[in-house]
């Protein structure tokens, strides 16, 4: 296993609809044809997997059916979008990249993106 640098933004603010997007960029030492990207969430020293996708030559990442993530790739950049976020989902979201093929296997883990989620205020009743 060889180490690889992964860069991601330090902070992202989710939209009022609970959507957060960020770019995860990896310094590929060669031309990988098969890449696996995993998003991990770290909160209160607990690390959980949010979503993962293996992609090849296409520009769209395909996630499992119940995933809250979507994404696209371009070169060594992966554009990730996480949906359905609420205030309780605020935390550090870490991008993990694995170059699966061809050998050698490379692994890179970013420093994480702190995603802040603010639940929208309910609209006050309006009298007309």
């Amino acid at each position: 296993c060889k180490a690889m640098h992964v860069a991601q933004p330090a902070v992202v603010l989710a939209s009022s609809r609970g959507i957060a997007s960020f770019v995860c960029e990896y310094a590929s030492p060669g031309k990988a044809t098969e890449v696996r990207v995993t998003v991990l969430r770290q909160a209160d020293s607990q690390v959980t997997e949010v979503c993962a996708a293996t992609y090849m030559m296409g520009n769209e990442l395909t996630f499992l059916d119940d995933s809250i993530c979507t994404g696209t790739s371009s070169g060594n950049q992966v554009n990730l979008t996480i949906q359905g976020l609420r205030a309780m989902d605020t935390g550090l979201y870490i991008c993990k990249v694995e170059l699966m093929y061809p050998p050698p296997y490379y692994l890179g883990i970013g420093n994480g993106t702190q995603i802040y989620v603010i639940d929208p205020e309910p609209c006050p009743d309006s009298d007309f």
């Epitope: 098969e34 030559m57 296409g58 769209e60 395909t62 499992l64 699966m100 061809p102």
Partner: antibody
């Protein structure tokens, strides 16, 4: 030129298994997914699963989980799909297709499940 | 699973007509891809990533849409366009296809 050549037609009995092959040529075999799609007579297209020929990573449609196995042989640039516990509803043309975009397709293999 | 519903399922048209086929997704998807299939043949990629024409596909074919609503348009039907058309998504597993739209000569 890119080609996907599939094995010949099969007639199998209910409960049996069938192993189909898809031989790729004309491109770098390990750079693209190989997908399997089937089409029952007069019906639409149904995705069965895919394999990454380099690592062997697979994704299967849950409808087929437990019944389908996809493997590859990089030395011959061939992908195999085995479907077990066959029933009459599995009678269909089975296609392999390349990549994320399904830009090249095999000619199809007709599988008939009949007693 | 993401369901894709095509409308209409059957369409009768004449050479030279402009026709539009719609693909509706049960959940928002990033892209839609379109395939053409003729009887006894394997499907053929027409349009990928919603609007990009595959190699060798005539410019009378076009695709558009976003989110849950997508369309395939043929600006002026040619005799060789009479076939069945399928949309497909690959945003989430399992990859799914629409039920197909059969385009017939009026």
């Amino acid at each position: 030129q890119v080609q996907l050549v599939q094995s010949g037609a099969e007639v199998v009995k209910p409960g049996a298994s069938v192993k189909l092959s898809c031989k790729a040529s004309g491109y770098t075999f390990t750079s693209y997914w190989i997908n399997w799609v089937r089409q029952a007579p007069g019906q639409g297209l149904e995705w069965i699963g895919r394999i990454a020929p380099g690592s062997g990573t697979t994704y299967y449609n849950e409808m087929f989980t437990g019944r389908v196995t996809m493997t590859r042989d990089t030395s011959t640039s061939t992908v195999y799909m085995e479907l077990s516990s066959l029933r009459s509803e599995d009678t269909a043309v089975y296609y392999c297709a390349r990549g994320d975009y399904f830009d090249y397709w095999g000619q199809g293999t007709m599988v008939t499940v009949s007693s | 699973d993401i369901q894709l519903t095509q409308s209409p399922s059957f369409l009768s048209a004449s050479v030279g007509d402009r026709v539009t086929i719609t693909c509706s997704a049960s959940k928002s998807v990033s892209y839609i891809h379109w395939y053409q299939q003729k009887p006894g043949k394997a499907p053929k990629l027409l349009i990928y990533d919603t609007s990009t024409l595959a190699s060798g596909v005539p410019s009378r074919f076009s695709g558009s849409g976003s989110g849950t609503e997508f369309t395939l348009t043929i600006s002026s039907l040619q005799p060789e366009d009479f076939a069945t058309y399928y949309c497909q998504q690959r945003t989430t597993y399992p990859l799914t296809f629409g039920q197909g739209t059969k385009l017939e000569i009026k």
